[in-house]
């Protein structure tokens, strides 16, 4: 064809506002003299004696120049129609990558500026290599490979089977009919790792213990547990209407909270992170609520229980003053929890 077809809809040619544009008559051989008209307008834009053959030159285009142009040969036969669409060449796309487990990561991108033109993205990646392998041919195991784009989620590609300790270079190239622009990004899985939040958070009262709650949860489904890549957890809790969270770092998948405010509902949430501190903490899980059981077991009610109401009022007053919830120092003959030294101190006192 005498008119190179930019990818995109057939019969459409592209230009940039404020720049000259050369349109090409699609239905004639190269160099054939043609006349040019705007579609629906009989006024001649450029005659066959222009010396430009089958091309139309527009000195400086702007939005009114968008539309359909008709070209005709000397015998009056229509050579064809071409539609001019204006826009901008791509700017460097903005790319970020994240991993929710230790062997896969995904990258998302957005245009650096809106081009107003049909746009596609070419996505690929390779494993970066340590300098010094000058004597060896680059190994096929370093790529590059395409980064498969997610069919369900536009502007996202996923790398499967990445090596946790390796560094990768991502190449996202935005292409439109006026050009291409590339963003390169170097990523280490261990730096971009952010697990999904823990799942299945349950908060239950501990019968007979009015200041305790038992919380339990599971690994996020996206984290394929292996002995080499465990998660650690962070748990936060607070009484209803209390703005400040108290934080503990549990061992394992459960925690007994020993310093709740008796009788009040408590919100609890958990977050996860690689146990060797790679990457960052996950988002918080959805909050789960629990209320400590009311009253001690009958055979555990001590003589000083008469003053308990006053003690509770004091604790609630503390809460209202924005101080984090703290254990009561009142004696408490309940079983010791080895993870709660304050509870032990209280009993010893």
């Amino acid at each position: 064809s005498p008119c190179p077809q930019a990818w995109g809809p057939p019969g459409v040619q592209y230009g940039q506002p404020g720049r000259p544009v050369m349109l090409c008559c699609p239905g004639v051989s190269a160099g054939t003299p043609v006349s040019w008209f705007r579609d629906g307008d009989s006024r001649l834009l450029q005659g066959p004696d222009s010396g430009l053959g089958h091309r139309l030159v527009l000195a400086q285009v702007d939005s009114p120049d968008e539309g359909t142009y008709v070209c005709q040969t000397l015998d009056g036969v229509s050579g064809g129609m071409v539609t001019l669409k204006l826009g901008f060449p791509p700017a460097r796309p903005e790319v970020s990558c994240q991993a929710v487990d230790y062997e896969n990561f995904s990258c998302t991108w957005s245009p650096g500026q809106v081009s107003g033109l049909p746009t596609r993205y070419l996505t690929s990646y390779r494993k970066k290599t340590l300098p010094g392998a000058e004597s060896q041919r680059e190994s096929p195991s370093t790529g590059p490979w395409p980064c498969p784009q997610d069919p369900l989620e536009a502007s996202r590609c996923v790398v499967h089977g990445a090596e946790f300790w390796s560094e990768y270079r991502i190449n996202v190239t935005e292409v439109n009919p006026l050009g291409a622009s590339t963003c390169l990004l170097d990523v280490r899985l261990q730096s971009i790792l952010r697990p999904d939040p823990p799942q299945g958070l349950r908060v239950e009262s501990v019968p007979g213990y009015p200041r305790r709650l038992h919380a339990s949860w599971t690994y996020p489904a996206s984290w394929r547990r292996q002995p080499h890549f465990l998660l650690k957890f962070r748990l936060q809790y607070r009484p209803a209407q209390h703005p400040a969270w108290s934080t503990v770092e549990p061992i394992g998948l459960e925690e007994v909270i020993t310093d709740t405010v008796a009788g009040l509902p408590h919100a609890v949430r958990v977050s996860a992170r690689d146990f060797l501190d790679a990457g960052t903490w996950s988002a918080w899980s959805p909050e789960a609520w629990g209320t400590p059981s009311t009253g001690l077991l009958q055979d555990e009610i001590p003589d000083w229980s008469q003053g308990h109401g006053q003690q509770l009022e004091a604790v609630v007053a503390q809460e209202d003053s924005l101080a984090p919830a703290r254990p009561s120092l009142q004696p408490d003959p309940r079983p010791l929890d080895h993870r709660d030294p304050l509870e032990q101190v209280a009993v010893l006192a």
Partner: antibody, heavy 126, light 112 residues
């Protein structure tokens, strides 16, 4: 074998032009930053120019800015240095070199030249 | 872009250590961890010894080590050997115009 091979050097008169080429083999050329470094006889290394993998961004030493143009053809695995308005002080061995570079979310950085060509001599003299 | 400052020469006997300094500014050496060191034997192309301040490419002996404090980077060659006699250059990302900058170069002589 990973290799860079420069060509195009020679004798040129002051004010003249020359185009150096660097043919790359043994690695995925289009993924690497590339640069030119020169060394005048008996002198030290001087950083000349640098180009991003896609060719979309370049950098130049002040001493050559406006006179030299770096470019690349990824389909041919070749790096170029077009030199105009040559001066006697441009006389040097010109090395082509590869850099993996480092790219953060905001920009890319020159890192280190890990592979070097054998160099091509450019002599500017009348 | 001014060249980074290196001592013109350094020397040591076989088995000894020699240290070469490379002084720049906060716009190059001090501002980035992209400092590299090269070894060049007469008539040969330079060879990368150290990159990103302290990292050694595969194949480079661990006798070569790099460090940085403020605007000054250093290369230390310990257990000096005859084949270490060469010119040594530091280099840094320059922070402007996608530019790099080399040091003035240091000639290392192995005595005896």
């Amino acid at each position: 074998e990973v290799q860079l091979l420069e060509s195009g050097g020679g004798l040129v008169q002051p004010g003249g032009s020359l185009r150096l080429s660097c043919a790359a083999s043994g690695f995925t050329f289009s993924w690497y930053f590339m640069g030119w470094v020169r060394q005048a006889p008996g002198k030290g290394l001087e950083w000349v120019s640098y180009i991003y993998p896609s060719g979309g961004s370049t950098g130049y030493a002040d001493s050559v800015k406006g006179r030299f143009t770096i470019s690349r053809d990824n389909s041919k695995n070749t790096l170029y240095l077009q030199m105009h308005s040559l001066r006697a002080e441009d006389t040097a061995v010109y090395y082509c070199a590869r850099d993996e570079g480092y790219c953060s979310s905001t920009s890319c950085y020159f890192d280190a030249f890990d592979i070097w060509g054998q160099g091509t001599m450019v002599t500017v003299s009348s | 872009q001014s060249a980074l400052t290196q001592p013109p020469s350094a020397s040591g006997s076989p088995g000894q250590s020699v240290a070469i300094s490379c002084t720049g500014t906060s716009s190059d050496v001090g501002g980035y961890n992209f400092v590299s060191w090269y070894q060049q034997h007469p008539g040969k192309a330079p060879k990368l010894l150290i990159y990103e301040v302290t990292k050694r490419p595969s194949g480079v002996p661990d006798r070569f080590s790099g460090s940085k404090a403020g605007n000054t980077a250093s290369l230390t060659v310990s257990g000096l050997q005859a084949e270490d006699e060469a010119d040594y250059y530091c280099s840094s990302y320059g922070g402007s115009n996608n530019a790099g900058v080399f040091g003035t170069g240091t000639k290392v002589t192995v005595l005896g």
